[in-house]
Each structure stands twice: as C-alpha cells, then as structure tokens.
C-alpha cells in the first residue's frame, strides 16, 4: 500500500538540489528537537503543524483522482509529489513565493470547460454539494491540484529536508507568504485566469461582507479573470434564514463587486437563493414539481 | 492483509429499502476510492459506483442514479450502498471492490473484492 | 458506454491444453499514457471474482503465469496454458479506460 512506498522512500527524501530562500526573520519562537548532543532548533509557529500523514494523503489523493478521472492518468502521482515538496521542504516557511509552485502547477494543468467554473466564497461546503450533483461544473477542488491540498496544512524548515508537523506559520499572527497561503494563492490565480464563458460565484448572505475584497475571491479570483475570455460573472447569493426574503443583491458590498468587475468590462449579474436545501433538491431533480417555482 | 467483510444476506419486499455495508480492514480506508457491483443470478458484473471515503464524494452508472445511494463511515471503515424502491429485478449478488496500487499508480483492475452479498425482493 | 462483447469456448477444454478466450472492446482501450485499460477476472463458483490481468497484459499479484493476456486497442485475448481443474469458472473482460467500467458477459470454462 502507500505507507509501505512511502516506507521505502523516506531516504529518498534527501536526494535533488533545493534552493533556499533568506535566513530566518519573523515572529516565530524558537524551541529545541533532536536528541544529538547538539541541541538543534525548530522554529516555533503561531498556526497549527502539518497534517498528519501528509505525504501519504497527497500520494493516496492523487492515486484516487487520477483512478476517477480518466483523462488525468497521464499524471505521475510520484512527480506530482516531489514537485510538491519540492515547494516548500528546506525552505524557510515565511519566504514562499509563487515561483516555487510552478513545476507543480506545470505537473497539474487542467482546463475547465467554458461556462463551467465555480468560484465560491466563504460557502465551500455548499459549493462543493452543488457540483457534486452538477457534475459538468467545477470548483478548484473538484481540480486535482485543489483537491490534493484541500483542507490540509503543511510547512518545512530552513536547510532541513524534514516537515514540520509541530506548528506552520499563521497567516495573519506571522506571515502570509507561508506555504499554505502561496499555495491557494497560486492555484486560485491559475483557475481565474483560465476561465471562460460565463463564471459563477457563490457567497455567502449570512455574512456581514457578502463580498469581501480580503477573500481570496475578491483579492486573486476577480483580478484575474481574463475580459477577452470571460463575458459575464454571476453571483449567486445564498440565503441563511428560512424567512429571508430581502434581496441581497442590493447589498453594498454586492454592488461594490458589481463596479468592480463591471471595471474589467465583464458583465454582472446576482440571484438570490433563497433556499439553498431547495435549490439542491432541485439540482438533483429539476423535474419536481415543488422546482417549478423560484428559490 | 485487505479484507472487505460484506453483511449477510438480505430479504426486502418490493418498495422497500435495504442497506448492506462492506467492512474495510488492513489498509487505510480514506487512502482508496470504493466501487460497488451488481451480479444478478446467473448473470454477468454490472458496476454501480464509486465513493471517496475521505470526501463522502460519490459517481454513479446512469441506470443505478436513481436506485443506489453510495455512503462511507470513516470512524468504522464502513462503506454502504442503500438501495431504494425495491422491485424483482434487484434481486442480486452485490459487491465492494477496490483496486491495487502499483508503484503509486491505481492498477484499473479490482483487486480486492468483498464476499457479496446477496439481495433478494420477495413479497 | 464502451461495449465488451467476449467468444465462447469449445467446451469442454481437455486437462492440460491451452484456451484462449477473446474479447472485443467498441473502441480502443489505449489510454494517451500507453497504459491498456483491459481486465480480466475469473469468478470461479461460489466465489467473488479474481484480478488475473490489469493493463492487458500485466499479472495480478499472485497469478499463476498460466495466465497471459494479450492484445490490441480493441482486441484481447487471454491465454490459459495448461487448463487445470482449478481454473474452472466464468472468465470476464472488463474495459477500466473511461466510466463506467463496463464488463464482457463472461466465457465459461469447463474442463474435460
């Protein structure tokens, strides 16, 4: 299985050159490890470690998306591995740059069909039940380099090959250049700028900034839809209250989203979902009565 | 050593709903995708569907959309299929499988099998 | 949906002789990364079935190398040499290129 792989890899995990990036500077703390008689240090982080068995749950995930999707097995899931790696193991966590996910990216190129892309903000499980029954439209995690990282955390060390599953940096408490962060940044950069047709994006109408220009949505994802490409974006606003019927595409932070990528000369357009149970429902059985109305 | 340990045979009566499990053990449950298959009496294999452990996520035949339900229990390395309105013809011998991987790459081929389970729609 | 379409035998199959089983895929099962997406299992009675051959031509773990499978994009042939009591069963071709996974309706083999 993938642990015996891995087993017989560790050794491997010193072999290929690895360029560093600057000696340490940040707000991290720093605390001994190792039991040589000479103490050696391990950079101590506000976020929490990598997760456990990170390198066997990105192998097993790659595995399992190139098994169900076809078209990918093309992919090397040992390649696409130690490109990963290779993207942040001995290199100072704080100091990650896009340049070093590109062999990744490289590895992971997908192109989503045209009218076919689904951004979301603040709503990922909403986001991804829908193109779970929708199953022509795509999230970033229905991608295989999203779907690799999706809900993982990981980190190295300066001049060390080893993962750190101790702590990672926190974005906001010690850097936003971490490997997590560059990570999504990457990837989400990469999947706007790719689209085409007509994009949608779900948001979430329960929150104080339906539209948040902090989001990765509202910093990487709307810069980076191409205009020659991209003839209409479409927010789809999803309700929290059963009896919610304002209509919260007159929101302010919907309107600034508007002039934002009315901007870029994309088109906008904004549904309100009122019942998000029902607009499921409806997905998975458009032909119900009950769907005939609006939700 | 991989097991499926599938659940014993099953009596339903039409329009009802039964669900079978299929018990993993000897390698990580999250780490595969599941498939299920259909083998009528005397009959040949006939693949339902997938489901990803680790996400719930699930891909179906065409014809078994409407008549499977594909779930995992993670704490129990449990897959399920439930099937719904039961009528004769979903009288079968229903198996997990999984497949082997070869040098981190999925083989194609379902490797591991359950002992089925047999589903008959009696009135 | 790829369509497995499997001959029959000239049954019974003396002990000891070579079978050869044929399998027709609708289209070609070779994938762009040069990997035949072609099966074969033997369900012997009573039993679940068994990988004998993935990628067309590679040995399951544990398989006797009586067993051999061979082939083009859309014609296979898997060769038992040496038929023994033990590989009484229905054999199945199963195409894994694209989903669904289809099956063949299975050739059964009985031994003289």
């Known amino acids: 299985g993938l642990n015996d792989i891995f087993e017989a890899q560790k050794i491997e995990w010193h072999e290929g050159s690895h360029h560093h990036h600057h000696h340490h500077h940040g707000s991290g703390s720093l605390v001994p490890r190792g039991s040589g008689s000479l103490p050696r240090w391990r950079q101590q982080w506000s976020g929490s470690g990598t997760t456990s068995r990170f390198p066997e749950t990105v192998l097993a995930r790659c595995v399992k998306y190139t098994e169900v999707h076809p078209e990918m097995r093309h992919v090397d899931c040992q390649s696409v591995w130690d490109a990963f790696k290779g993207a942040f193991i001995s290199k100072y966590p704080c100091n990650i740059t896009e340049e070093d996910y590109q062999p990744l990216v490289k590895l992971g190129t997908q192109t989503v069909p045209c009218n076919k892309t689904l951004l979301w903000s603040r709503i990922k499980d909403l986001a991804h039940q829908f193109t779970q029954v929708q199953r022509d439209m795509f999230t970033l995690e229905d991608m295989l380099l999203g779907y690799l990282a999706d809900d993982l955390t990981w980190c190295g060390e300066f001049n060390t090959f080893e993962i750190n599953y101790q702590s990672c940096p926190d974005w906001r408490k010690d850097c936003s250049n971490n490997p997590v962060s560059v990570f999504w940044k990457t990837v989400s950069r990469r999947f706007a700028e790719t689209a085409c047709g007509v994009v949608h994006v779900m948001l979430n109408g329960s929150r104080s900034k339906i539209f948040d220009k902090n989001s990765t949505f509202g910093s990487v994802e709307v810069h980076n839809l191409q205009p020659e490409k991209v003839q209409a974006l479409e927010a789809w606003v999803i309700h929290g209250g059963r009896e919610d019927s304002r209509d919260l595409c007159q929101d302010p932070t919907i309107k600034e989203l508007e002039s934002i990528i009315s901007k870029r000369n994309i088109r906008f357009f904004c549904k309100n979902i009122y019942r998000p149970d029902k607009f499921l429902q409806c997905v998975k059985n458009p032909e119900d009565s009950s769907c005939l109305s609006g939700i | 050593e991989v097991q499926l340990q599938q659940s014993g045979p099953e009596v339903g009566r039409p329009g009802s709903s039964v669900k079978i499990s299929c018990k993993a053990s000897?390698?990580?449950?999250?780490?595969?995708?599941m498939h299920w298959v259909k083998q009528s009496p005397g009959q040949g294999l006939e693949w339902i569907g997938w489901i990803d452990p680790e996400y719930g996520s699930t891909d179906y035949a065409e014809k078994f959309k409407k008549k499977a339900t594909l779930t995992a229990d993670t704490s129990s390395s449990t897959a399920y299929i439930q099937l719904s309105s039961l009528t004769s013809e979903d009288t079968a011998t229903y198996f997990c499988a999984r497949v082997a991987i070869i040098t981190t790459v999925a083989s194609g081929g379902f490797a591991y099998w359950g002992q089925g389970t047999l589903v008959t729609v009696s009135s | 949906d790829i369509v497995m379409t499997q001959g029959a035998l000239p049954n019974p199959v003396p002990s000891g002789e070579s079978a050869s089983i044929t399998c027709q895929s609708s289209e070609s099962l070779l994938h762009s990364n040069g990997k035949t997406y072609l099966n074969w299992y033997l369900q012997r009675p009573g039993q679940s079935p068994q990988l004998l051959i993935y990628w067309m031509s590679t040995r399951a773990a544990g398989v006797s190398d009586r067993f051999s499978g061979s082939g083009s994009g859309t014609d296979f042939t898997l060769t038992i040499s040496g038929v023994e009591a033990e590989d009484v069963g229905v054999y199945y071709c199963q195409q894994f290129l694209e989903y669904p996974p289809t099956f063949g309706s299975g050739t059964k083999l009985e031994i003289k």
């Open positions: 000897g390698y990580i449950f999250t780490d595969y995708i």
